[in-house]
């Protein structure tokens, strides 16, 4: 079974950094990912950036660069404007959609007692959708 | 719950111009659609696809507008906009703005997997 992992990580330098972390891990190619926050795309989540293979990448603050660190794996940063850090307390999804098979989410989010420039661990919670 | 609101309808002349915008908004989030498409009724007429664009920016067009109508999205990617250029009567109609998302983030066939509806802002091309 296809499954997505997510990963939640806060810069060391900058604790207003953040990266997140997405991966695929089954067969099949990827035809769009989206990340979102807040909760699952479309059911109450923000898309913060939505990566295609061909068309590029559209992403919006407070996301700051998102790109692809493999042909099924990709990776977002952002940039906390605030004084407080709400990253800390936020859920990223991650959905991947392999187009015809279907589509795979997962969400994360930065442990509480995370040291900064330590990631924390994949936590898949795959979220089955037959788009 | 996600609510189309649409906008700029009214009478213009032969030859005129006119721009229609659609806010997409939601409860407790904000909502981004891969697509955006504006559809148009006719008085006693079906409903006609008139264009559509994806969150990449792609668009697609009917051929009884293409050249006169230009679709376009703000970068937030959550308001759609009609810019319709050298109206004629034709163009009367209803103009409906829906949304909804695809498998791989492009504009379906226009009308298929959009399950969210404005509920329109009339448009009425008369000297």
């Known amino acids: 079974t296809p499954e997505v992992w997510v990963q939640v990580q806060m810069e060391a330098t900058e604790l207003s950094s953040f990266t997140v972390h997405c991966g695929f891990l089954g067969p099949g190619s990827i035809s769009l990912v989206t990340v979102s926050w807040g909760g699952p795309d479309g059911a109450g989540g923000t898309k913060l950036a939505v990566l295609h293979p061909e068309l590029g990448t559209r992403q919006w603050a407070p996301a700051r660069q998102a790109r692809w660190e493999t042909q099924s794996s990709i990776s977002l940063a952002l940039e906390d404007s605030g004084a407080s850090s709400p990253f800390a307390n936020t859920t990223f999804c991650c959905k991947f959609a392999s187009f015809p098979e279907g589509s795979w989410e997962s969400c994360g989010s930065l442990p509480p007692s995370s040291d900064p420039g330590l990631s924390a661990p994949p936590t898949p919670v795959p979220i089955l959708r037959a788009d | 719950h996600v609510q189309l609101v649409e906008s700029g309808g009214g009478l213009v002349q032969p030859g005129g111009s006119l721009r229609l915008s659609c806010v997409a908004s939601a409860s407790g989030f904000t909502y981004r659609p891969y697509c955006m498409a504006w559809f148009r009724q006719a008085p006693g007429k079906g409903l006609e696809a008139v264009a559509g664009?994806?969150?990449?920016?792609?668009?697609t067009y009917a051929d009884s507008v293409k050249g006169r109508f230009t679709a376009s999205r703000d970068n937030a990617g959550f308001s759609l906009y009609l810019q319709m250029n050298s109206l004629r009567a034709e163009d009367t109609a209803v103009y409906y703005c829906?949304?909804?998302?695809?498998?791989?983030?492009?504009?379906?066939?226009?009308?298929?997997?959009?399950?969210?509806w404005g509920q329109g802002t009339m448009v009425t091309v008369s000297s």
């Open positions: 829906a949304a909804g998302d695809s498998p791989d983030g492009r504009c379906p066939p226009l009308g298929q997997g959009l399950n969210y």
């Open positions: 664009i994806d969150i990449f920016g792609g668009t």
